[in-house]
C-alpha cells in the first residue's frame, strides 16, 4: 500500500517546520526494476540524506532564515550506478517558527514636527526588522508608545501607527504642543513581532527624541496706511509666510466689497493696489490663506487688519444751505440763540476736524454792527450788545466762516426777531374724559385729538405748541404728535398697551412752547390737560423668552441627554404645556412641563445639521391659546463614518495585453466634517495577496493611485481591495472594492463579441 | 527713501543712566518693527529685542531681558534704548535696524550709536 | 557664545569662489525657512544680502547666493571682488520670538 510516505519517484514539495530536531523520515521513494539505488543531488547542505533504498531524511535541524527552500533531485540509479530514472525536482519548504526578534535599525532616532501640524499626518518613521517570514504572524511587527516625556495631564501628544511606524500628532498634540512651554519631547517606541498579539511575542525598544518647532502661519501685526497716498502703486504693507516654501497664497473678502484694493503675491507679500479713502472706509479686515498645490487649504487663514489714517482732505460743510434761528425781542445779553453745527468728514477728535467759528459779516449793520457773537469752538451764537427791535429790522443775515487747519467754508445764518412770548398756551378742554380701550389696539393709531391755543405771533417759537405727557405713561407707551399749521395734538400708541401692567392709566399733558417765556410769565394750569386710559383684558398667547433657542450638543450623545430647554411665559400668568412640532426624524421629546428637551434616539450630524424643529406653548386652561417657536439643535461631528468612495467606480479597464504598467485615479471621501483643512485620507490595499500585483499611492488628502506592477495580468474582471483609513479619533477604515477589467480593445474601448453585453466597462486606462 | 537715523556717540560712567534714539523716516514708522543689536568691541552682532511701535508691542532676547529697556513714540518716528545702571560690560556699538513682521530678517540699518562706559 | 556656528575666516583669490557655512540646530536654522546673511564693513551699518534662505534684496548682485541644507546654511560668493572684503553674519529664527546672530566670517579677498 503507497501511503503519504511512500511512493513512486515522482516531482514532489514538502513543508518542514525549521528548527526542530528530525523525528521522522521525509519519504520512501520505492524503486521500479531496474533501479536498485538512489541518488540525492542539490541544495542539500549536508542535512538531506537519501539512503540507497529510498529512505529521505534529514539529520539535524532546518533554519528558514538560511535558506527558506531547498531545491533538491532525487534519481534512481541501477546495479551499475546508471541513472534510469529521473532526476525529479524534490522541493523543501522550510516553515517560519518565531525565532528571532525584531530589531529596530537605530538605536535613537531625532526628528522635529511642527507646532498645530495636521494629527495623523506622519513626520518621522522608526524602522524595525525581523528576520522572520512576514507572510506569517512570526515577522508581522507591531509598533507602539511605551511613554511619552513629559506626559502634561496624562494627554498622549504623539501616536504611532502600529504597522508602519509613522509617528505623528493626535488631535491634542496638534492643538496643544508649544514650544514656548515644551520645546522638546522623548518617546520610548517598542515593537514586537507576532502582530503584537501573543505573551511570547519578542520585542525590541528605541527612544525618539522630538523638537517641536513653532508654527509660524500667524496673523501679522495691524498695519496702518494713509489714504490718497501718491505714491506708485502696488505698495507691499505687510507679509505672511506659510511653514514651508510651495504655498499658494490668496486673500479672502469677508466684507464681499465693491471694490477690494489688496492683493497678495506667491511669496506671501500683500500689497494696497490703489490709494484708499478713510471717508469710505477708515478700516479693513480680510483674510490671507495658504493652500496645498491641489488647492487645499493647508491651515486656518489668518485675519489682516489695514487701518487708513486719516489726512485733512475734506472742507467744513454747513449743515444747510441757510440756518434759520429765532430771537425775540426783548431778549437779554448774552442769551442763546442757536448753534450752527458745521460737519467735516475727517476723523473724529482729530486737528484734521476739528472746526473754528466766526463771523465775517452781519447784514444790515442796524443799529450797529456786532449784534451778535459766535463761540469759536462751540458754534453757538449768542446776543452781544443790546435786545432787538423788530419793527427795526426783522430780520439779520450772518455770514460765518467754519474752518479746519487747512480749508474755510462760508456758512449763512438767517437770524429772525419775533415777538415776545408772553402768552402761554391754553388747552380747550382740561380734562379729556375716559378713553377704553382693548391691550392689543393697534400700535401706531391714533386714541385722542387734544387742542391748545396760543396768542403769540403766529408761525414763531413762540406760538409753536409742543405737547409732552409729563404724568401717568412712564413705559413710554403714548405719544403725541402735533400738526405744526393748526397746533393740533393726535394721542398715537407708542408700544403695545397691557392690562396685566397698566389696566388704569391718569395721563397728564403739558403744552409748552420751543421759545422761552419772557421774565415774569409762567406756565399755569391752562397749559395742562388730563385723560384717563383704562385697558380692557384680551386673553393672549404664551410669550417665547426667544424667538430662536439654540443648543449644541455632539452627535454621539447618549439617549436620554438633555439637549437644550426653552422658556415661555403667559401674560395672564397661566401654567404652560410645552410640545414639540416637526421632529420629523423622532430624535427628541419635550419635558411638558419644564421644556427640557431630551434626545430619544441617535442623533447624526450627517443627516443634516442644525435639526430644527418648532416648539409649542400652550396655556393650560383658559382658552389653550398657544404660540410656536423655533428650537435648533446643532449638532457637532464625531468621526463615525468610515471612508467610501466618492464616485461609482465600475467600468474602469486596461486594454489586454498591457504594453506598460498602468494606473487609474480614484478619489475618496467620508461623511464627517472637515473644517479647512479637508480630509487627509491614507490608502492602502486590502490584502497582502494584493502586493503582487498592485500597489497604491496617496496623491493628496482624498486621491490616490491605483498603479499595475507588471503587465502579466490575465484577460478578464479584477477586484481590487483598498483600505482608507480616515485618521480620525477613533480612525475609522473603510473597505471599498475597485472592479478593474482587463480586456481586449478596438479603437480604445473593450470589445465583446455580439451578444456578449453585460457588464461592459467604460472608462479605459 | 528708507533712513534710520540713530544719536551721537555717548561717554557715560557705571552707574548712570542712558537713553539713546533711533529715528526712522521715508516710510510709515508704525507698520514695522525696530530692532536693537549690540556689537561689542572685536565682537559680533547680537539681536537685543524689538519693538513695533504701532502698538509698542515689545519682545526682547533672553539674554537682555531685564538689562534694557526698548520704547517707541510712533508720534515722531522714534526708538529708544534705555540703560537705568549702566555697567563698563555694556560698552559697545549699538545698532537700530528695520525689522520686517512675520520674517524676521532686518532690512535696513541705523548707523550705529557707540556707547563707552568707564568704571 | 553665539547659537549659530561660523568659521572665523575664509579667503579666496579675485575671481574664485567662497563659501560660508552657519550651523544650527533643527530649532534654528533646520527648523524655519528664515535664515538671512548680512555684510558688515567695520565702521558702517550692516548690509542685508540674503533673506528668507536664499532671496536677494534688489541691488544685491547675484554674485551672492544662498541654500540651506538640514541644519547647515550657507553663503556663496562667486567672482570675489575686493569690495566683497568684509565680516558676513548669518542669522536664524529661533522660536519663540527671538533672533539668533552666528560669531560672524571674515572674508578675506587675497
Known amino acids: 500500500q503507497e501511503g503519504k510516505f511512500s511512493g513512486p519517484l515522482k516531482p514532489m514539495t514538502f513543508s518542514i517546520y525549521e528548527g526542530q530536531e528530525p523525528s521522522q523520515i521525509i519519504f520512501q521513494f520505492k524503486a521500479n526494476p531496474p533501479a536498485v539505488t538512489f541518488e540525492l543531488t542539490g541544495e542539500t547542505d549536508n542535512i538531506f540524506v537519501i539512503e540507497r533504498e529510498g529512505l529521505l531524511y534529514y539529520n539535524r535541524a532546518l533554519d528558514r532564515e538560511t535558506r527558506s527552500t531547498h531545491n533538491l533531485q532525487v534519481a534512481a540509479l541501477d546495479a551499475n550506478g546508471i541513472i534510469v530514472e529521473g532526476p525529479v525536482p524534490i522541493t523543501i519548504k522550510v516553515k517560519d517558527i518565531n525565532d528571532n526578534r525584531p530589531t529596530f535599525l537605530q538605536s535613537k532616532y531625532e526628528g522635529s514636527v511642527r507646532q498645530n501640524s495636521r494629527p495623523g499626518k506622519p513626520f518621522l518613521y522608526v524602522n524595525a526588522t525581523d528576520l522572520d517570514d512576514p507572510a506569517t504572524p512570526n515577522g508581522q511587527l507591531y509598533y507602539q508608545i511605551v511613554i511619552q516625556l513629559p506626559m502634561i495631564n496624562n494627554v498622549m501628544y504623539f501616536q504611532i501607527n502600529n504597522k508602519t511606524g509613522a509617528i505623528s500628532l493626535t488631535r491634542e498634540g496638534s492643538q496643544e504642543l508649544n514650544p514656548a512651554k515644551n520645546p522638546s519631547y522623548n518617546l520610548v517606541i517598542s515593537v514586537k513581532d507576532m502582530g503584537g498579539q501573543s505573551e511570547n511575542s519578542f520585542s525590541d525598544t528605541t527612544s525618539v527624541d522630538i523638537i517641536v518647532t513653532e508654527n509660524i502661519w500667524k496673523a501679522p501685526k495691524p498695519v496702518e496706511m494713509v489714504e490718497n497716498s501718491t505714491d506708485p502703486h502696488p505698495i507691499k504693507i505687510t507679509q505672511v509666510r506659510w511653514n514651508d516654501p510651495g504655498a499658494q497664497y490668496s486673500l479672502v473678502d469677508k466684507e464681499k466689497l465693491p471694490r477690494f484694493p489688496f492683493s497678495i503675491d506667491q511669496e506671501g507679500d500683500i500689497y494696497v493696489t490703489q490709494p484708499l479713502d478713510r471717508e469710505e472706509k477708515d478700516a479693513y479686515v480680510f483674510y490671507a490663506v495658504a493652500k496645498d498645490e491641489y488647492g487645499k487649504p493647508l491651515s486656518y487663514p489668518l485675519e489682516i487688519h489695514v487701518k487708513v489714517k486719516d489726512i485733512n482732505d475734506n472742507p467744513p460743510t454747513c449743515p444747510s444751505p441757510v440756518t434759520v434761528f429765532e430771537v425775540q425781542e426783548n431778549e437779554r445779553l448774552g442769551n442763546s440763540i442757536g448753534t450752527l453745527t458745521a460737519h467735516d468728514r475727517d476723523e473724529e477728535n482729530t486737528a484734521n476736524s476739528f472746526l473754528n467759528y466766526r463771523i465775517v459779516e452781519q447784514t444790515p449793520k442796524l443799529p450797529m454792527d456786532g449784534l451778535f457773537l459766535i463761540q469759536t469752538y462751540a458754534g453757538m451764537l449768542q446776543l452781544a450788545k443790546q435786545s432787538l427791535k423788530k419793527q427795526d429790522t426783522p430780520q439779520y443775515n450772518l455770514t460765518i466762516e467754519v474752518s479746519d487747519k487747512d480749508f474755510k467754508t462760508l456758512c449763512f445764518v438767517q437770524i429772525n426777531v419775533i415777538d415776545i412770548n408772553d402768552q402761554i398756551p391754553i388747552f380747550e378742554k382740561s380734562d379729556y374724559g375716559n378713553l377704553t380701550l382693548a391691550e392689543d389696539t393697534n400700535i401706531g393709531s391714533t386714541i385722542l385729538t387734544i387742542q391748545a391755543t396760543d396768542a403769540d405771533e403766529p408761525f414763531t417759537g413762540s406760538s409753536k405748541i409742543l405737547y409732552h405727557i409729563i404724568k401717568g405713561d412712564s413705559e413710554g407707551r403714548l405719544g403725541v404728535d402735533t400738526d405744526p399749521h393748526t397746533n393740533t395734538g393726535y394721542v398715537i400708541i407708542k408700544k403695545p398697551l397691557d392690562f396685566e401692567t397698566a389696566a388704569v392709566s391718569n395721563i397728564v399733558f403739558k403744552a409748552e412752547n420751543p421759545e422761552p417765556l419772557v421774565f415774569g410769565v409762567k406756565y399755569n394750569a391752562s397749559s395742562f390737560a388730563k385723560f384717563t386710559l383704562i385697558v380692557t383684558d384680551v386673553n393672549e398667547a404664551p410669550q417665547f423668552s426667544q424667538h430662536v433657542f439654540q443648543a449644541k450638543v455632539s452627535e454621539d450623545v447618549a439617549i436620554g441627554t438633555k439637549v437644550g430647554n426653552v422658556t415661555a411665559k403667559d401674560p395672564e400668568g397661566l401654567d404652560i404645556s410645552y410640545s414639540l412640532r416637526g421632529d420629523t426624524r423622532g430624535w427628541l421629546k419635550i419635558d411638558h412641563v419644564t421644556g427640557e428637551i431630551f434626545s430619544v434616539a441617535p442623533l447624526d450630524r450627517e443627516a443634516g445639521s442644525p435639526y430644527r424643529v418648532q416648539v409649542v406653548a400652550t396655556e393650560v386652561g383658559g382658552s389653550s391659546l398657544s404660540s410656536v417657536s423655533e428650537f435648533h439643535l446643532i449638532l457637532m461631528d464625531v468621526n463615525d463614518n468610515p471612508p467610501r468612495l466618492a464616485k461609482d467606480y465600475t467600468g474602469l479597464f486596461f486594454c489586454h495585453p498591457l504594453s506598460a504598467p498602468g494606473s487609474l485615479i480614484f478619489e475618496a471621501t467620508d461623511d464627517d466634517q472637515h473644517l479647512f483643512r479637508g480630509p487627509h485620507f491614507t490608502f492602502s490595499l486590502g490584502s497582502g495577496s494584493l502586493q503582487n500585483d498592485w500597489e497604491v499611492s496617496k496623491i493628496n488628502g482624498t486621491h490616490a493611485r491605483l498603479s499595475t506592477r507588471h503587465t502579466e495580468f490575465e484577460e478578464r474582471e479584477y477586484v481590487v481591495l483598498i483600505r482608507i483609513n480616515d485618521g480620525g479619533r477613533p480612525p475609522l477604515e473603510g473597505i471599498v472594492s475597485l472592479p478593474v477589467t482587463f480586456c481586449s480593445c478596438v479603437e480604445g474601448s473593450c470589445f465583446r463579441p455580439a451578444g456578449h453585453q453585460t457588464g461592459i466597462p467604460t472608462v479605459g486606462m | 527713501q528708507v533712513q534710520l537715523v540713530q544719536s551721537g556717540a555717548e561717554v557715560r560712567k557705571s552707574g548712570e543712566s542712558l537713553k539713546i534714539s533711533c529715528e526712522g523716516s521715508?516710510?510709515?514708522?508704525?507698520?514695522?518693527?525696530i530692532a536693537w543689536v549690540r556689537q561689542m568691541p572685536g565682537k559680533g552682532l547680537e539681536w537685543m529685542g524689538i519693538?513695533?511701535?504701532?502698538?509698542?508691542?515689545?519682545r526682547y532676547s533672553p539674554s537682555f531681558q531685564g538689562q534694557v529697556t526698548i520704547s517707541a513714540d510712533k508720534s515722531i518716528s522714534t526708538a529708544y534704548l534705555q540703560w537705568n545702571t549702566l555697567k563698563a560690560s555694556d560698552t559697545a556699538m549699538y545698532f537700530c535696524?528695520?525689522?520686517?513682521?512675520?520674517?524676521?530678517?532686518?532690512?535696513?540699518w541705523g548707523q550705529g550709536t557707540l556707547v563707552t562706559v568707564s568704571s | 557664545q553665539p547659537v549659530l556656528t561660523q568659521p572665523p575666516s575664509a579667503s579666496g583669490s579675485p575671481g574664485q569662489s567662497v563659501t560660508i557655512s552657519c550651523t544650527g540646530t533643527?530649532?534654528?536654522?533646520?527648523?524655519?525657512?528664515?535664515v538671512s546673511w548680512y555684510q558688515h564693513h567695520p565702521g558702517k551699518a550692516p548690509k542685508l544680502m540674503i533673506y528668507?534662505?536664499?532671496k536677494r534684496p534688489s541691488g544685491v548682485p547675484d554674485r551672492f547666493s544662498a541654500s540651506k541644507s538640514g541644519n547647515t546654511a550657507s553663503l556663496t560668493v562667486s567672482g570675489l571682488q575686493a569690495d566683497d572684503e568684509a565680516d558676513y553674519y548669518c542669522?536664524?529664527?529661533?522660536?519663540?520670538?527671538?533672533?539668533?546672530f552666528g560669531g560672524g566670517t571674515k572674508l578675506t579677498v587675497l
Open positions: 519693538i513695533y511701535p504701532g502698538d509698542s508691542d515689545t
Open positions: 528668507e534662505v536664499s
Open positions: 542669522s536664524s529664527y529661533a522660536g519663540n520670538d527671538n533672533l539668533q
Open positions: 533643527s530649532s534654528d536654522v533646520g527648523g524655519y525657512n528664515f
Open positions: 521715508g516710510y510709515s514708522f508704525g507698520n514695522y518693527w
Open positions: 535696524a528695520r525689522h520686517v513682521d512675520s520674517t524676521w530678517y532686518i532690512d535696513h
